[in-house]
Amino acid sequence: SGPVKELVGSVGGAVTFPLKSKVKQVDSIVWTFNTTPLVTIQPEGGTIIVTQNRNRERVDFPDGGYSLKLSKLKKNDSGIYYVGIYSSSLQQPSTQEYVLHVYEHLSKPKVTMGLQSNKNGTCVTNLTCCMEHGEEDVIYTWKALGQAANESHNGSILPISWRWGESDMTFICVARNPVSRNFSSPILARKLCEGAADDPDSSMV
């Protein structure tokens, strides 16, 4: 029995739970998901029983080995998987536990602008990047392009301070999760600040 194995999959994709055994006479292999039986295999008997019929088309054994491949992944496939190898030659079953996290492919992140002020020819605001559907485990970074050196900023909120007359800047939010990444539409500093340009002391949302 080894340490818990963490696996990552994407919705609609597939994941393989690796399993090896050098036991000669394996009587049965039992896979469970969150304590519910998933598959029972009897290698000598040549039988594979998938407990729930709807999972039959999703279960496979690459290259005829013991590893279990689960395809057409759904969000609710996330959880704890457990396998036991039972053999009369083993005093107790050989076991392995896995934790599966299934993530969605990220859609385009949405950017909103916070309160904007324009003082002494400098436009000051915050840009906030977020996912519309509240996806989990998303990491946000900002890319600021256009000045002498391109800059990166970690976090969903980007504070902006841009002086009129400076070269224009482009801001792009990058959203990442363990299986994908996506980019916001580019935002130009000049366009962003145009709304406040007429009134040097104005604030707007």
Epitope: K22, P43, G46, T47, I48, D63, G64
Partner: antibody, heavy 120, light 108 residues
Framework: QVQLVQSGAEVKKPGASVKVSCKAS????????MNWVRQAPGQGLEWMGR????????KYQGKFKGKVTLTADKSTSTAYMELSSLRSEDTAVYYC?????????????WGQGTLVTVSS | DIQMTQSPSSLSASVGDRVTITCKAS??????VAWYQQKPGKAPKLLIY???YRYTGVPSRFSGSGSGTDFTLTISSLQPEDFATYYC??????????FGGGTKVEIK
């Protein structure tokens, strides 16, 4: 990648013996059953027996007990099939074939076959 | 020993046809049936094991079904490279394992 390479064709006289080899590579030889299957000219497939190289445990189909001896050399990852008291009806192509792990009676990798001709 | 009776022994079909081959076991073998494809002068190739599990790399047009004593191999749309001889094999419990007599799929 998994490969099973068999020894070359043999011509033998009735009553003689023949030993066919099957060299395995690309997997853990000692942990998978190795089967032997024969096919007479223009005929179907006939399972002869299997051996577990890890401990040399061998199982035979009834009609081949005493006629076939299966052995394995772990140091060279080679399985052997010896056929004794040859008769003309033993003329066939002999295949070695590895068992899958998940269903040990199903055979996923096969050697290229060795033709044994028994003729006086 | 368990006998495997395969039918038909030969059939003629055209590219694109749906082809069905059946195999009957002389006693209950649960779902322990494999299917192989063999071309002249070549070793057999595993297509299906445990009645319905496609082996890695086998095209999805090949499917297997059945349990107990009655089993079927279906080729949903026959391709030029599928003209060959097909064998069923029971791999139930302890050996001996036995093969069906084979079905030769020929070009119509």
């Amino acid at each position: 990648q998994v490969q099973l390479v068999q020894s070359g064709a043999e011509v033998k006289k009735p009553g003689a013996s023949v030993k066919v080899s099957c060299k395995a590579s690309g997997y853990t030889f000692s942990s998978s059953w190795m089967n032997w299957v024969r096919q007479a000219p223009g005929q179907g497939l006939e399972w002869m027996g299997r051996i577990y190289p890890g401990d040399a445990d061998a199982k035979y189909q009834g009609k081949f007990k005493g006629k076939v001896t299966l052995t394995a050399d772990k140091s060279t990852s080679t399985a052997y099939m010896e056929l004794s008291s040859l008769r003309s009806e033993d003329t066939a192509v002999y295949y070695c074939a590895r068992s899958t792990m998940i269903a040990t009676g199903a055979m996923d990798y096969w050697g290229q076959g060795t033709l044994v001709t028994v003729s006086s | 020993d368990i006998q495997m009776t395969q039918s038909p022994s030969s059939l003629s079909a055209s590219v694109g046809d749906r082809v069905t081959i059946t195999c009957k076991a002389s006693q209950d073998v649960s779902t322990a049936v494999a299917w192989y494809q063999q071309k002249p002068g070549k070793a057999p190739k595993l297509l299906i094991y445990s009645a319905s599990y496609r082996y890695t790399g086998v095209p999805s047009r090949f499917s297997g079904s059945g349990s107990g004593t009655d089993f079927t191999l279906t080729i949903s749309s026959l391709q030029p490279e599928d003209f060959a001889t097909y064998y069923c094999q029971q791999h139930y419990s302890t050996p001996p394992y036995t093969f069906g007599g084979g079905t030769k799929v020929e070009i119509k």
